[in-house]
């Protein structure tokens, strides 16, 4: 028996359902009584879901997995994972045994988009050219961790005096805070771009300093 899975990682958004595709080619006369199907976490060998002795043995993994019972006889051994969490991310191995056995691993990549950045300025009043200001760009509830890029009004990257920190919340999603320290010119725009590397999603925030008032 030959097992086939997707070469590319399956990308799933947090809280959505994902299908980890796995298939085999049944011989003529194949019946489900002959099938042993096991899904497990590749690294820890933890059992996720199984079908043995002619019946679905159910989920061994947080009760959020399901097979496609009507399609098994056609060789579809795919696994449905419901309400995906950050902790579900990783490699899953599909084992199929009929007379002989084969296995293959598929990677699940979890993602969550970042919020539109909020911008704060310190100090935020009585600003003069030549003042040192701290601009903070904050974006929330994304996954995996973000890359943050700063640019000035002319699109020139600002790389010095930038400190970026990540904080994972109880769901494993990241809040990102990036701080730019810059000496003010006569006026100027400072932009931060928060990029989710998996989704290739860019979230933009900017602050324009033109004397008073400030524009966000």
């Amino acid at each position: 028996v030959e097992v086939q899975v997707s070469e590319d990682p399956v990308v799933a958004l947090v809280d959505t359902d994902a299908t980890l595709r796995c298939s085999f080619s049944p011989e003529p006369g194949f019946s489900l009584a002959q099938l042993n199907l096991i899904w497990q976490l590749t690294d820890t060998k933890q059992l996720v879901h199984s079908f043995t002795e002619g019946r679905d043995q159910g989920s061994a993994y947080s009760n959020r997995t399901a097979l496609f019972p009507d399609l098994l006889v056609q060789g579809n051994a795919s696994l449905r994972l419901q309400r995906v969490r950050v902790t579900d991310e990783g490699s899953y191995t599909c084992f199929v045994s009929i007379q002989d056995f084969d296995s293959a691993a598929v990677s699940l990549q979890v993602a969550a988009p970042y919020s539109k950045p909020s911008m704060t300025l310190e100090p935020n009043k009585d600003l003069r050219p030549g003042n040192m200001v701290t601009i903070t760009c904050s974006s929330y509830q994304g996954y995996p961790e973000a890359e943050v890029f700063w640019k000035d009004g002319q699109g020139v990257p600002l790389t010095g005096n930038v400190t970026t920190s990540q904080m994972a919340n109880e769901r494993g999603l990241f809040d990102v805070h990036s701080v730019l320290r810059v000496v003010l010119g006569a006026n100027g725009t400072y932009s931060c771009l928060v990029r989710n590397p998996v989704l290739q999603q860019d979230a933009h925030g900017s602050v324009t300093i033109t004397g008073q008032p400030l524009t966000f």
């Epitope: 590749t42 690294d43 950050v86 902790t87 991310e89 990783g90 490699s91 691993a105 990677s107 990549q109 996954y143 995996p144 961790e145 890359e147 920190s165 990540q166 904080m167 994972a168 109880e170 494993g172 999603l173 990241f174 590397p197 998996v198």
Partner: antibody
Framework: DVQLVESGGGVVRPGESLRLSCAAS????????MNWVRQAPGEGLEWVSR?????????YYADSVKGRFTISRDNSKNTLYLQMNSLRAEDTAVYYC?????????????WGLGTLVTVSS | EIVLTQSPGTLSLSPGERATLSCRAS??????LAWYQQKPGQAPRLLIY???SRATGIPARFSGSGSGTEFTLTISSLQSGDFAVYYC??????????FGGGTKVEIK
């Protein structure tokens, strides 16, 4: 079994360079963030650098090494690297390769045995 | 940067006694704290993560508790192999990922 094996340590003079390697096995290397942690003789543990998983190459450094050290990984070779330039006496330490428990939980569930870097004139 | 302060610096106890090690964070880190054991000449070993979850293969005599800024590692009955240095580490906000200065548990 998970194994992390560091190599590349040695004795160098201040200002010189060294490249450390960490060969990983027993887990899906590309799925995990990886780190370097060091320990100066008789001192505590100090996190040095982290690189996130897959091929995204998002990297982080301790202030003490920023601009001098570069972390990288080759997922096809299951290997983590640390390029150390402009070495100083205070970089003398045992350097450990450590695997993050997950991409969002940066505790270190597996460690290598370490490789000693000595910077001395 | 989150600073972790471990106390005491050294704990002198006899086998069979109970060891209580403290780790205090300079700001709240929820439960994002790990504990490690390190014996001389060896790499650190993960004992506890998530403040209270035992790592794979760690005996039940090791337990962790606390959240926010105050954390405790308890060894219920010290065995000869438990005399070592113990470090706490936070992973709530980074970089940097920070360690405490360590507590040495030695034989009295």
């Amino acid at each position: 079994d998970v194994q992390l094996v560091e190599s590349g340590g040695g004795v160098v003079r201040p200002g010189e360079s060294l490249r450390l390697s960490c060969a990983a096995s027993g887990f899906t290397f590309s799925n995990y963030a990886m780190n370097w942690v060091r320990q100066a003789p008789g001192e505590g543990l100090e996190w040095v650098s982290r690189i996130n998983y897959k091929g995204y190459n998002i990297t982080y450094y301790a202030d003490s090494v920023k601009g001098r050290f570069t972390i990288s990984r080759d997922n096809s070779k299951n290997t983590l690297y640390l390029q150390m330039n402009s070495l100083r006496a205070e970089d003398t330490a045992v350097y450990y390769c450590a695997k993050s428990g997950s991409n969002s939980n940066n505790f270190f569930d597996y460690w290598g045995l370490g490789t000693l870097v000595t910077v001395s004139s | 940067e989150i600073v972790l302060t471990q106390s005491p610096g050294t704990l002198s106890l006899s086998p069979g006694e109970r060891a209580t090690l403290s780790c205090r964070a300079s700001q709240s880190i929820r439960s994002d704290l790990a504990w490690y054991q390190q014996k001389p000449g060896q790499a650190p070993r993960l004992l506890i993560y998530g403040a209270a979850s035992r790592a794979t293969g760690i005996p039940a005599r090791f337990s962790g508790s606390g959240s926010g800024t105050e954390f405790t590692l308890t060894i219920s009955s010290l065995q000869s192999g438990d005399f070592a240095v113990y470090y706490c580490q936070q992973y709530n906000s980074w970089p940097p990922l920070t360690f405490g200065g360590g507590t040495k548990v030695e034989i009295k």
